[in-house]
Interface confidence: medium
């Protein structure tokens, strides 16, 4: 921003009013007035070039400092050429001085030399020759000086001639300030510029309404240089939540929208699902039966609770189920839906039920399931069993109600035991089986079938309260196919399936190779 | 100021489709959301669908199969597209801004008009 | 699908008259119920929204009022500037457009 200037004193304005002193009194300086654009102007002047040493002073009037540091001096003037004036005349100049004086009150026409300090000698850029003089046309020259730091009330100027030929059309004091300035959304007043030329006078902003320094942000500031330009801008204000920057200034958010935090981001739509907001809005209040999950944006839309899962299937093989079911119908507008499977059980005989996550298997975690299936295992026989799956998704904690979709299924066998070879000899198989820990207690005995290969005739049976038996008085180097099952109060359960082992040949040395 | 402006082609053969772009200024596509809303020859305003300015669309369920509206925001543009047109689908299209989340429209172009016809 | 209904399809005034027109939703809107004006040339215009919020540059001779299932639009000194068809429209669920009305002057 260009700087601001100050007018203390304006020679050339006053019209010949000011009234300045002049020393020796009535010798050197003179007023005179001239008719320029038919317009009166005042000059200050002395042509003193062929009198030999001269000393003339011109002092201003006192000039009130105020709140100014550094005044700088303009100065337009006319100086002639000494060639000009017959034999060059040897005392005359071509310059004259510049001098200052501070002090807290007016002397008056007390006038001491001593008091007065010089601040430079004036030379022109251009002299006025006697061809110009005599077709009047005056090089007008213009000089700036500054000064400073002032300190007392106020001050004098002083012009010293020493024997030129100079006239003074204009003499103006001024000082700069930066003006007064809207930048970041802050505001920094008219500030008095500094007197030192590498010295930045640091001035610290105020936010615009409805604007804040952000969190951990710099308060702004800006150096208000000599000139009187700003310099260096450091930190900003932003509009606050709910205000939006338009040109200089914060504006509220339009109904309609709204705007969460102090940032440099417009007010934004408030989103699907949301009521209508009013002005200044810092969030949209979602609709009834609409939600926000704690890290959902306030730029995303209110969300709800899934439905139900689709379509839900309870497949059941052996002691175990497949549970198979597709997503909702409603996402609720969310994609972060997981699925849970809770399991009941109840027994057919009493009527009795209760949960069985404890005494299932599940073929992995059943709590925030991404996929759309699970396999239970470790299913009682004889037993109904009822598989709720709920779908939920980031904000079904909000409500109480639950979205989930039940199938049931009743296992009337048990698993199918597992069955292995322990050891073999030329006439006997040793054979051993399990279940799952939670059937064993529903078996009665196990049943093992076994016959030879390709003899469909006949078969043999073994039944055991144990999980092995050694078959014996059997046929060397022949396949047998062996099954076991389990036999509980209310019948058969799954068969193994079958398997097929083979007795030693006599050759083969050992009694029980395995 | 807010402006909108429908560009068509004109006449359109019956089962052929339909493309309509909106230009849009004065305001800026990502921040404001626009629909299309269109109204044959002496009859009443049907609601056609509209994209919001995060980008999802919402259509008129009885159109939904045939419509679909996109949009370039760096060119601010909307594009309604609507296959197998028939005679009843000629009309004035129109685009409309929607006005914050009051669910209505305060801005709208000043419509092209679609003759369906061989 | 939410039905509107504009039971009066033309509506004939004088100039300075204080007219309303109705409009009927088929079932509780919430006051999500705006108002448009259709000059003949095709021009459309929003002049009221949520019931009765008046949109900026609107004359102050436009009000609405409403609730439920029920809303309507006064004009409280016809011009005739103002000849032009009016349409109700519902934001509850998507969007839908009463028939219109269509006002003349006498």
């Known amino acids: 921003a260009q700087g601001k200037e100050v007018v203390l004193l304006d020679f050339a304005a006053a019209g010949g009013e000011l009234g300045w002193l002049t020393h020796p009194y009535g010798k050197g300086w003179d007023l005179m007035q001239n008719i320029m654009n038919d317009m009166p102007i005042y000059m200050y002047s002395v042509c003193n070039v062929m009198s030999g040493d001269q000393d003339n002073w011109l002092r201003t009037n006192w000039v009130y400092r105020g709140e100014a540091e550094r005044i700088f001096i303009e100065l337009k003037f006319t100086v002639r050429d000494c060639n000009s004036f017959p034999g060059g005349a040897s005392s005359c100049k071509e310059t004259f001085n510049l001098y200052y004086a501070e002090s807290d009150l007016d002397y008056g026409t007390n006038f001491q030399k001593r008091l007065f300090t010089k601040i430079d000698t004036i030379a022109p850029d251009e002299i006025t020759v006697s061809s110009d003089f005599e077709a009047r046309h005056v090089k007008l020259n213009v000089e700036e000086r500054s000064v400073g730091p002032l300190t007392r009330k106020g001050f004098y100027l002083a012009f010293q001639d020493i024997g030129a030929c100079v006239a003074l059309l204009s003499v103006r004091v001024y000082y700069k300030k930066c003006p007064e300035l809207l930048q970041g959304l802050a505001h920094f007043p008219e500030t008095i510029a500094g007197s030192d030329a590498p010295s930045l006078a640091t001035v610290a902003g105020t936010c615009v309404d409805h604007a804040v320094v952000p969190p951990g942000g710099e308060e702004p500031r800006m150096h208000c240089a000599v000139d009187g330009e700003w310099l260096v801008p450091i930190g900003q204000c932003l509009c606050q939540a709910g205000y939006e920057k338009v040109e200089d200034a914060c504006q509220a958010c339009s109904p309609g929208f709204f705007k969460f935090e102090a940032s440099e981001s417009p007010c934004l739509e408030c989103p699907e699902h949301t009521l209508p907001s009013p002005e200044g809005a810092t969030s949209c209040e979602c609709e009834e039966g609409f939600f926000r999950a704690p890290q959902d944006p306030a730029s995303m839309p209110c969300t709800r609770p899934p439905s139900a899962p689709h379509y839900l299937t309870a497949v059941g093989m052996g002691a175990k189920v497949e549970l198979r079911w597709t997503p909702p119908q409603d996402s609720g507008g969310r994609e972060d839906i997981v699925y849970s499977v809770t399991c009941e059980q109840c027994w057919p005989e009493s009527g009795e039920c209760g949960p069985c996550e404890a005494s299932v298997r599940y073929s992995e975690p059943p709590h925030g399931l991404t996929r759309t299936s699970v396999t239970v295992s470790d299913l009682e026989p004889h037993m109904n069993y009822t598989f709720t799956v709920e779908a939920r998704n980031g904000v079904s904690g909000l409500v109480t109600s639950r979205s989930f979709r039940t199938a049931s299924v009743s296992i009337n066998q048990t698993e199918p035991p597992k069955v292995r070879l322990e050891g073999r000899s030329t006439t006997s198989l040793s054979v051993s089986w399990s279940i799952p820990p939670p059937q064993q207690s529903r078996v009665w005995k196990y049943e093992v079938t076994y016959r030879k290969k390709g003899d469909s005739n006949s078969y043999n049976v073994r039944r055991t309260e144990g999980f092995s038996v050694t078959l014996d008085d059997l046929a060397p180097d022949t396949t047998y196919l062996v099954q076991v099952q389990a036999l509980t109060q209310e019948g058969q359960g799954a068969g193994s399936k079958v398997h097929e082992f083979q007795t030693l040949s006599p050759e083969g040395s050992g009694n029980l190779a395995v | 100021q807010v402006q909108l402006k429908e560009s068509g082609p004109g006449l359109v053969a019956p089962s052929q489709s339909l493309s309509i772009t909106c230009t849009v200024s004065?305001?800026?596509?990502?921040?404001?959301?626009v629909h299309w809303v269109r109204q044959p020859p002496g009859k009443g305003l049907e609601w056609l669908g509209m994209i919001w300015g995060g980008g999802s669309t919402d259509y008129n369920s009885a159109l939904k199969s045939r419509l679909s509206i996109s949009k370039d925001n760096s060119k601010s543009q909307v594009f309604l597209k609507m296959n197998s047109l028939q005679t009843d689908d000629t009309a004035m299209y129109y685009c409309a801004r929607k006005h914050g989340n009051y669910y209505t429209m305060d801005y709208w172009g000043q419509g092209t008009s679609v003759t369906v016809s061989s | 699908d939410i039905q509107m209904t504009q039971t009066t399809s033309s509506l004939s005034a004088s100039l300075g008259d204080r007219i309303t027109i109705s409009c009927r939703a088929s079932q509780d809107i919430s006051n999500y119920l705006n108002w448009y004006q259709q000059k003949p040339d095709g021009t459309v215009k929003l002049l009221i929204y949520?019931?009765?919020r008046l949109h900026s540059g609107v004359p102050s001779r436009f009000s609405g009022s409403g609730s439920g299932t029920d809303y309507s639009l006064t004009i409280s000194n016809l011009e005739q500037e103002d000849i032009a068809t009016y349409f109700c429209?519902?934001?509850?669920?998507?969007?839908?457009f009463g028939g219109g009305t269509k006002l003349e002057i006498k």
């Open positions: 004065g305001f800026s596509l990502s921040r404001y959301s």
């Open positions: 949520y019931t009765s």
């Open positions: 429209q519902q934001g509850y669920t998507l969007y839908t």
